[in-house]
């Protein structure tokens, strides 16, 4: 799903207040709900009818440093016999997410939000049409 | 997928530098890759063998203000005949994502990162075993 454009209004102070100096604002250290857990370590990527693999990208100047991308293993979907059914399609499910980019010059460190497109997994769909003649 | 704990080291200055004052840091206005777009197949939520609906949550003090959550429509998966196959299960694909929380008292505005668990869509899986006793 798509993150709407910021329009930068979200990060502005109310009109009656003095403007933010130098085009930056205060970001508190710490993360709300940091201990929240995903209950998904169940190998669904292998047991799905539209299975996928994971690739990890690593960037020490990004938070989170590790971003995991899914790639569908097949074009078709896997049927009950474990064979690829090419009348159905494995398609990626994508999600826009935010990361934080760290920029530093010596002891001057600043941060900026960055939008990243993540493929989270795959799902099996019926194609809209089979052939265009 | 799970976002690792910050350990707060990411947001710290190098050891040789003076510490961040007041437990906050500088966040630049603007978002990198703001114009990037999701290129997901059309209506996959309805054409999937594990279809889902979307619910939108709205919070003006969160960026993005709109967070979309998927809910699987069925327990089983939809077969080629359009019937629910109860030997297969529709399961959610979940992703931890970051949002920005805005906190203000009068003209003093600060921001904090928050982890949110988003269900992005659903996929069809074969359960490992039939019964646990």
């Amino acid at each position: 799903r798509k993150i709407p454009k910021v329009g930068h209004t979200f990060f502005q102070k109310p009109e009656s207040c003095p403007p933010v100096p130098g085009g930056s604002m205060k970001l508190d250290i710490g993360i709300i709900n940091e201990n929240q857990r995903v209950s998904m370590s169940r190998n669904i990527e292998s047991r799905s009818t539209s299975p996928w693999n994971y690739t990890v990208t690593w960037d020490p100047n990004r938070y989170p440093s590790e971003v995991v991308q899914a790639q569908c293993r097949n074009l078709g979907c896997i049927n009950a016999q474990g064979k690829e059914d090419i009348s159905m399609n494995s398609v990626p499910i994508q999600q826009e997410t935010l990361v934080v980019r760290r920029k530093h010059q010596g002891c001057s460190v600043s941060f900026q939000l960055e939008k990243v497109l993540v493929t989270v997994g795959c799902t099996c769909v019926t194609p809209v049409i089979h052939h265009v003649q | 997928r799970k976002i690792p704990k910050v350990g707060h080291t990411f947001f710290q200055k190098p050891e040789s530098c003076p510490p961040v004052p007041g437990g906050s840091m500088k966040l630049d206005i603007g978002i990198i890759n703001e114009n990037q777009r999701v290129s997901m197949s059309r209506n996959i939520e309805s054409r999937s063998t594990s279809p889902w609906n979307y619910t939108v949550t709205w919070d003006p003090n969160r960026y993005p203000s709109e967070v979309v959550q998927a809910q699987c429509r069925n327990l089983g998966c939809i077969n080629a005949q359009g019937k629910e196959d109860i030997s297969m299960n529709s399961v959610p694909i979940q992703q931890e994502t970051l949002v920005v929380r805005r906190k203000h008292q009068g003209c003093s505005v600060s921001f904090q990162l928050e982890k949110v668990l988003v269900t992005v869509g659903c996929t069809c899986v074969t359960p490992v075993i039939h019964h646990v006793q």
């Epitope: - | 089983g76 109860i86 299960n89 359960p127 039939h130």
Partner: antibody
Framework: EVQLQQSGPELVKPGASVKISCKTS????????MHWVKQSHGKRLEWIGG????????SYNQNFKGKATLTVDKSSSTASMELRSLTSEDSAVFYC????????????????WGQGTSVTVSS | DIQMTQSPSSLSASVGDRVTITCSAS?????MHWYQQKPGKVPKLLIY???KLASGVPSRFSGSGSGTDFTLTISSLQPEDVATYYC?????????FGQGTKLEIK
């Protein structure tokens, strides 16, 4: 220990609605499906439907669509079923029964049962 | 819907007898479960996936069959086996149960 504690017996008038609940303990409520089963007096068991709190998925027996509505309250680990437009045919004992998690065990595998709630429809 | 027909609807047998209950499905199913419901109690899973014994169930109970015809057998009937037995198909939506077989001791 897994426990499913159902609400008490109900005596309701024809045309009315009733909501029966199933409070759970001893397991992570969100991760398992909850099914509802009807047993008319001394008769066969009929599966009404099931709901999974984690996925949001619901599955109904077509014979009960429009008659039964299944809901969950994650905060209290409680599943509920509302029955509407009741007639004497709806007089029965209704069971909640835990199904699988969808990952390791199939959603439709029933292992634990509540003690049953008797619903009597009478004017 | 797949219809499940049990036979007999009721039966009376003596302690130590071998008892057989059959369940016929209106179309082919992959798996059959059997439940035992003692008077005034909730149903309890007895046999799952046609032939697997549920936890805590005595070995005198067994299940077999395939396709449309399935059988529950009690090799040596005990007084505590007085109950109604239900078959349940787990193949096609919706889940369906047999009408039940009421077992009594002579």
């Amino acid at each position: 220990e897994v426990q499913l504690q159902q609400s008490g017996p109900e005596l309701v008038k024809p045309g009315a609605s009733v909501k029966i609940s199933c409070k759970t303990s001893g397991y992570t409520f969100n991760e398992y499906t909850m099914h509802w089963v009807k047993q008319s007096h001394g008769k066969r068991l009929e599966w009404i439907g099931g709901i999974n709190p984690n996925s949001g998925g619901v599955s109904y027996n077509q014979n009960f669509k429009g008659k039964a509505t299944l809901t969950v309250d994650k905060s209290s680990s409680t599943a509920s079923m509302e029955l509407r437009s009741l007639t004497s045919e709806d007089s029965a004992v209704f069971y909640c029964a835990r199904g699988g998690d969808g990952y390791y065990t199939n959603y439709f595998d029933i292992d634990y049962w509540g003690q049953g709630t008797s619903v009597t429809v009478s004017s | 819907d797949i219809q499940m027909t049990q036979s007999p609807s009721s039966l009376s047998a003596s302690v130590g007898d071998r008892v057989t209950i059959t369940c016929s499905a209106s179309s082919s199913v992959n798996y059959m479960h059997w439940y035992q419901q003692k008077p005034g109690k909730v149903p309890k899973l007895l046999i799952y996936d046609t032939s697997k014994l549920a936890s805590g169930v005595p070995s005198r109970f067994s299940g077999s069959g395939s396709g449309t015809d399935f059988t529950l057998t009690i090799s040596s009937l005990q007084p505590e086996d007085v109950a109604t037995y239900y078959c349940q198909q787990w193949n096609s939506h919706p889940l369906t149960f047999g009408q039940g077989t009421k077992l009594e001791i002579k």
